[in-house]
C-alpha cells in the first residue's frame, strides 16, 4: 500500500504559496533609455535606417523607474500569472561585490534586486531573497575569494558575512525572509578532491551562515523584524528493501550524512550528528578512509547552536538505498551508501521518481529530531518535457501538496510555506519551469493557481477566503512599503 | 547500559495529580524519543504519549486534555504531568525508550514502572 | 483508533513445539511501503520486551526460534519450538496512526 488517501482540508491563512527562481543576474542598465535621453531624434526610415539627432531640442525626462528594466518586467508579468504570495530569488555575490569586500560595492546590482523586490510587493507578491546560490558548475563567488581558496578558506565565512551585512541594510527594509546559503549540503559535489576538503569547507559554509544570522539578530532583527534561515537539500531516503535491516540503516545513514550535517549544529547541539562522527571515525580506526569531521571549539558550538528562526527545505524526490561498504578518503564513500533506480516507478526525463509520500515522512522526521519549528518548503518541483501540457507536473504539484498537508493536519507539522520550482526554464537545461524559457506559459501555471486559490483541497462547501482583517492588514503593510520606498 | 528509571509513583486521591519522572542513563534525551505506557493491574498496555528528540510531543487524544509530558536533557530526565486523577487511572506507568529510527517505530528499553494508585 | 485484537487469547502448548498467535487491525497498519507492526513478550512483574519490528524484523538478541510475518491488517508471531522461558504475555502492537495501539494479549503456557 504505498499511500494514505487523499485528505480533504486546507492550509492556513498565513501560508506562504510561493515560486523559486535560483540567481537574478542583475541588468547593469535599465533598458529603456529613451525616457532619461533628453534629445529629440529623427528617424531615417528609408534611408539609412538611423538616428538623427535635432540639435537645439532638449525634451523633458522623466526618472528611471524600476519597470525599465525589460527583466523585471518580463518577471512581474510572470508572477502576476501564477498568483503566488511570495516569490524566491537569489542575489548574485559576485555582482554586488565583484572583489569580495565592501571596497567596491556595485550599487547598480543592489538597485535592481531592490525594484524586483518593491515592484512585487505592489502586486502583493512578498520576495524571500537567497544571499547566496552556489551551482555546480559555477560556485557564485567573487573571483578575489574564489582564487583564495574559496570555501576552504575560513575568511571567506567572514566575506560572506560582510556581503550579508550590506543586502540586510541595503533590502532588509522589504525583505522579511532571508535564506543565507542555498544547499550548502550540495557544495560536496564541488569540494570533493577529498573527505576533509568536503568537511572543511561545510564547517567554513555552517560559520559563515552563523555569523550572517548573529549579525541579523544583532544589527538588524530590532528593526526589520525579518527572519533568516539557510536551504538544506532534503531528499528523502528509503531502504531499497524494506526487510532488510542494513538497507534502512543505510537510510538512516543518508539522512544523517544528508541533512543532519548542517541541521544538528545549527538547530540543536551546535555540533555534528554524533551517528555521523562516530561512522567516519569508525572508518578511520579500520584503515577505510582518512577522513575526519572537524572538532568544533566550545566558542564554535555556541557560534553555530540555534541559529536559524526557520526550517528551509528543498525536497524533491526519495531516494532508494542500500548498504555497500566503500573504501577511499571522499565523502561519497565515507556514507558506504549505494542509491538503487526502481524503474518501476514514475519518473521524470532526469529520473528523478515522484514519490509524494516521501515530503510526508521528511516533515515527520523533522519535526520529531528538531522540534516544532516552522517548515518552508523552499524549493520542491520536477522536470517536464512537455512545453504547453505539463501533466506530470500538474499530477508531481497535487500529489506533493497532498502529503504536505497530512503532514500539517495529522502528523501536526508547522509547515508554513510552499514554493515550487521553479519560475522559468533556462535553455537547454531540464525543464523545471511554470514558463518556457521564451516566456510561454504552461498548463501547470492554472492547476497551482487552483490550490493557491483554495488554499489546498477543500471541502466542498468549505469557504477559502481568510478573514477579511487579515487582508487588510497585508495590503496596508504593503501599501505602507511602497509608499515608504518607490 | 541502558536503562530508564521511574519514580514518583504512590497513591494519590481522586482528582489530584501526578508528576512522574524517567531517569535515562547511558543514551541522551538529545538522540532518542521517550514513551510513557500504562498497565491497569491484570490489563493490557495503554500508549499514553511520547515525547521525541527534538521536543515535540505526540498524545494519545483520550488523555490530552489531562497529560503533559516534558523533559530537560541537561537532567537526562523526562516528566509525565497528569490531573484530575481518577480510579480508573490506578495502574503501573513505564517509561520506556524509542527506537531512535525514523525507519523503526517500536520501543526497545522499558522502565520497570511505577505503581499509581489513585483511591481516597 | 486502530483495534488490535489478538487470537487466541491464551495457548498451551507443548515444549518444542510450535506456537502460533494471530493479531488482526481494524485497519491497514502498512503504509508508504512500510508494516508498522511490533511484537513484545511480558514475562510476570517484568516490563515487556521487544521481539520483532517492522512486522518481521528480529531484534538484537532475541532467539531465531521467534520470527514475524504479515502485512495489511493480518500479522502472525510464530515461536518455531517453544522453550520453557518463553512462558510470558505476547503483545503486538501498531504504529502506523496514532494513538499507537496494543493488542489484548495473548497468554503462552505450557501443556
Known amino acids: 500500500k504505498e499511500s494514505t488517501p487523499d485528505v480533504q482540508g486546507q492550509f492556513p491563512c498565513d501560508f506562504s504559496w510561493g515560486v523559486t527562481e535560483s540567481v537574478l543576474k542583475p541588468e547593469s542598465v535599465a533598458s529603456s533609455p529613451q525616457f532619461s535621453d533628453p534629445h529629440l531624434y529623427v528617424w531615417n526610415a528609408t534611408g539609412n535606417r538611423l538616428l538623427h539627432r535635432v540639435e537645439g531640442v532638449r525634451l523633458k525626462t522623466r526618472p528611471a523607474q524600476c519597470t525599465d528594466f525589460v527583466n523585471i518586467k518580463k518577471q512581474l508579468e510572470m508572477l502576476a500569472r501564477m498568483k503566488v504570495t511570495h516569490y524566491r530569488f537569489a542575489l548574485d555575490w559576485a555582482s554586488v561585490l565583484p572583489t569580495g569586500n565592501l571596497s567596491a560595492v556595485n550599487r547598480q546590482a543592489l538597485r535592481y534586486y531592490r525594484c524586483v523586490v518593491s515592484e512585487g510587493l505592489k502586486l502583493g507578491i512578498s520576495a524571500m531573497v537567497t544571499l547566496y546560490y552556489p551551482t555546480h558548475a559555477h560556485l557564485g563567488l567573487p573571483e578575489p575569494l574564489l582564487h583564495a581558496d574559496g570555501w576552504l578558506n575560513p575568511s571567506t565565512a567572514e566575506a560572506f558575512q560582510a556581503y550579508a551585512g550590506l543586502c540586510f541594510q541595503e533590502l532588509g527594509d522589504l525583505v522579511k525572509l532571508w535564506i543565507t546559503i542555498n544547499e550548502p549540503n550540495r557544495l560536496s559535489d564541488i569540494y570533493n578532491r577529498s573527505g576533509n576538503d568536503t568537511y572543511g569547507a561545510a564547517h567554513n559554509l555552517l560559520v559563515a551562515h552563523a555569523l550572517a544570522w548573529r549579525l541579523y539578530d544583532r544589527q538588524f532583527r530590532p528593526s526589520q523584524r525579518g527572519a533568516v534561515s539557510l536551504s538544506l537539500h532534503a531528499d528523502w531516503a528509503e531502504p531499497a528493501n524494506p526487510y532488510a535491516d542494513s538497507h534502512w540503516r543505510a537510510a538512516e545513514r543518508f539522512l544523517q550524512f544528508e541533512i543532519a550535517w548542517f541541521a544538528e549544529p545549527l538547530f540543536k547541539t551546535g555540533d555534528y550528528p554524533a551517528a555521523m562522527r562516530e561512522y567516519i571515525a569508525s572508518k578511520h580506526r579500520r584503515g577505510l578512509s582518512s577522513s575526519a569531521l572537524p572538532r568544533l571549539t566550545e566558542a564554535e558550538r555556541r557560534l553555530l547552536k540555534g541559529t536559524v528562526d526557520f526550517c528551509a527545505l528543498n525536497h524533491f524526490t526519495t531516494r532508494f538505498v542500500m548498504h555497500e561498504q566503500l573504501a577511499g578518503s571522499r565523502y561519497d564513500s565515507d556514507r558506504d551508501i549505494q542509491f538503487l533506480q526502481d524503474i518501476t516507478r514514475l519518473s521524470s526525463p532526469t529520473r528523478l521518481a515522484v514519490i509524494p509520500w516521501g515530503v510526508r515522512k521528511l516533515l515527520r522526521w523533522v519535526r520529531r529530531n528538531y522540534g516544532d519549528m516552522d517548515i518552508y518548503i523552499t524549493a520542491s518541483g520536477i522536470d517536464d518535457q512537455a512545453l504547453e501540457d505539463d501533466r506530470l507536473r500538474k499530477y508531481y504539484l497535487g500529489k506533493y501538496l497532498q502529503e504536505v498537508l497530512k503532514a500539517y493536519l495529522i502528523d501536526k507539522v508547522r509547515i508554513k510555506g510552499y514554493y515550487a520550482f521553479k519560475l522559468a526554464e533556462e535553455k537547454s537545461k531540464p525543464r523545471f519551469g511554470f514558463f518556457t524559457s521564451d516566456f510561454k506559459a504552461k498548463s501547470s501555471i492554472q492547476f497551482y493557481n487552483k490550490v493557491i486559490s483554495s488554499r489546498g483541497f477543500p471541502f466542498e462547501n468549505s469557504s477559502s477566503r481568510c478573514s477579511q482583517t487579515q487582508e487588510n492588514t497585508e495590503c496596508t503593510v504593503c501599501l505602507f512599503l511602497v509608499q515608504k520606498k518607490p | 547500559e541502558v536503562q530508564l528509571v521511574e519514580s514518583g509513583g504512590g497513591l494519590v486521591q481522586p482528582g489530584g495529580s501526578l508528576r512522574l519522572s524517567c531517569a535515562a542513563s547511558d543514551f541522551s534525551l538529545t538522540t532518542y524519543g521517550v514513551h510513557w505506557v500504562r498497565q491497569a493491574p491484570g490489563k493490557g498496555l495503554e500508549w499514553l504519549g511520547v515525547i521525541w528528540s527534538g521536543g515535540s510531543t505526540d498524545y494519545n487524544a483520550a488523555f490530552i486534555s489531562r497529560l503533559t509530558i516534558s523533559k530537560d536533557n541537561s537532567k537526562n530526565t523526562v516528566y509525565l504531568q497528569m490531573n484530575s486523577l481518577r480510579a480508573e487511572d490506578t495502574a503501573v506507568y513505564y517509561c520506556?525508550?524509542?527506537?531512535?529510527?525514523?525507519?523503526?517505530?517500536?520501543?526497545?528499553?522499558w522502565g520497570q514502572g511505577t505503581l499509581v494508585t489513585v483511591s481516597s | 483508533d486502530i483495534v488490535l485484537t489478538q487470537s487466541p487469547d491464551s495457548l498451551a502448548v507443548s515444549l518444542g513445539e510450535r506456537a502460533t498467535i494471530n493479531c488482526r487491525a481494524s485497519e491497514s497498519v502498512e503504509s508508504y511501503g512500510n508494516r508498522y507492526m511490533t511484537w513484545y513478550q511480558q514475562k510476570p512483574g517484568q516490563p515487556p520486551k521487544l521481539l520483532i519490528y517492522r512486522a518481521a524484523n528480529l531484534q538484537s538478541g532475541v532467539p531465531d526460534r521467534f520470527s514475524g510475518s504479515g502485512s495489511g491488517t493480518d500479522f502472525t508471531l510464530t515461536i518455531s519450538s517453544l522453550q520453557a522461558e518463553d512462558v510470558a504475555v505476547y503483545y503486538c502492537?501498531?504504529?502506523?496512526?496514532?494513538?499507537?495501539?496494543f493488542g489484548q494479549g495473548t497468554k503462552v503456557e505450557i501443556k
Open positions: 502492537q501498531q504504529s502506523n496512526e496514532d494513538p499507537w495501539t
Open positions: 520506556a525508550r524509542d527506537y531512535g529510527s525514523t525507519y523503526v517505530d517500536a520501543i526497545d528499553y
